[in-house]
């Protein structure tokens, strides 16, 4: 029960964590003008990775798509493409999370086959989450040298004429929406891997055990050999000189809740 | 350090046209947009063009069909053409170009339209 309870919300907290990814990855606001310390309050521009928007005074706000891949900034790239694959990883974990739920039963799939997906998915979840989080921070960081570059060059040029004023951009809602949402898939693949441990069926040891009375009722087949169980021929043929129960190895087992006499 | 240089303003007589030039030097990429504002005397900063990377330009409504913004990408300059020029013209025209991480303005250049 604490396993499906366990996998169930593993599986929910994951699906929400995607949702989120792709949210943030679709949003415009990942850099936004710095409203502090502004120098020009008649536009407010905000960025995102398809696109870039300027709200005037007015009110008007115009988005523009970045229709080019050369005059883009490498980075810029290399954070697209951080959250695609977060997304794609994050899809299918759901798609073989989904077939994994212990609470859903496809056909006669065993117990292994469904830990294996479910572990399957976790680290799919989890390589997703990461993926988020990388991407978002890699963005956020770019944005933070490019603040503090900016900071600095607003201080040096208040000696003599400024030639160039800068407006420099903070974090924007998406890095956060990201942030959070690649720790909840992160957390949801950590839940399915840990599910997967108590779906995984224990390692059962079918070894034949023949049992016979000690004493004098000891039964023989012809050509004094011993009668197999059902579990796999005798195929070693070894003659019972003694009382008691023996595998077929000569090692000795004590009965299971595997074996019925 | 990046440096917005704009030049090409003066005096002009109603009817006349002035080009407005803007040059961005120094370490600026992946620009988004570069684009003209306008402040008039004890007024705020509107927005009279923006050249976008890619895509037509927007213009504000009260230059629609008198302006032209043009800009060269490979140079990083942006121009604006201004025919018909009218008293209510007159303002410091501001230059801008907006990244991906930053906003860049221009020290800004006087146009002043005589009637």
């Known amino acids: 029960m604490a396993v499906t309870a366990c996998q169930g919300l593993g599986f929910v907290v994951s699906l929400i964590g995607i949702a989120g990814i792709i949210a943030a990855t679709c949003m415009d606001q990942w850099s936004t003008q710095d409203l502090y310390n502004n120098p020009v309050t008649a536009v407010f521009n905000y960025q995102g990775l398809w696109r870039s928007c300027v709200r005037e005074s007015s009110g008007f706000t115009e988005c523009r798509g970045y229709f080019t891949l050369l005059g883009l900034p490498a980075m810029l790239q290399a954070v697209r493409a951080l959250m695609i694959v977060g997304i794609v990883l994050g899809a299918i974990g759901l798609l073989v999370s989904i077939f994994a739920l212990k609470c859903i039963r496809i056909g006669s799939m065993e117990d292994s086959a469904k830990a294996n997906m479910t572990l399957t998915s976790g680290i799919m979840f989890i390589v997703s989450g990461l993926c988020a989080i990388a991407g978002v921070s890699v963005f956020a960081n770019m944005l933070v040298t490019n603040f503090w570059m900016s900071t600095a060059n607003m201080y040096t040029g208040m000696g003599g004429m400024v030639q160039t004023v800068q407006t420099r951009y903070t974090f924007g809602a998406a890095l956060f929406v990201g942030w959070v949402a690649g720790g909840l898939t992160l957390i949801g693949g950590v839940m399915m891997c840990i599910a997967c441990r108590g779906l995984a069926p224990e390692e059962t040891n079918y070894k034949a055990v023949s049992y016979h009375a000690s004493g004098h009722s000891v039964a023989y087949k012809p050509g004094g050999f011993k009668a197999s169980t059902g579990f796999g021929s005798n195929t070693k043929n070894k003659k019972i000189y003694d009382g008691g129960a023996r595998t077929e190895d000569e090692v000795q087992s004590y009965p299971s809740k595997h074996d019925y006499v | 350090q990046v440096k917005l240089e704009e030049s090409g303003g003066g005096l002009v007589q109603a009817g006349g046209s002035l080009r407005l030039s803007c040059a961005a030097s120094?370490?600026?990429?992946?620009?988004?947009?570069m684009a003209w504002y306008r402040q008039a005397p004890g007024k705020q900063r509107d927005l009279v063009a923006r050249a976008w990377t890619t895509g037509p330009p927007t213009y504000a409504e009260s230059v629609k069909g008198r302006f032209t913004i043009s800009r060269d990408n490979a140079k990083n300059t942006v121009y604006l053409q201004m025919n018909n020029l009218k008293p209510e013209d007159t303002g410091v025209y501001y230059c801008?170009?907006?990244?991906?991480?930053?906003?860049?303005w221009g020290q800004g250049i006087q146009v002043t339209v005589s009637s």
């Open positions: 120094g370490s600026i990429s992946g620009i988004n947009y």
């Open positions: 801008t170009a907006n990244t991906l991480t930053s906003g860049y």
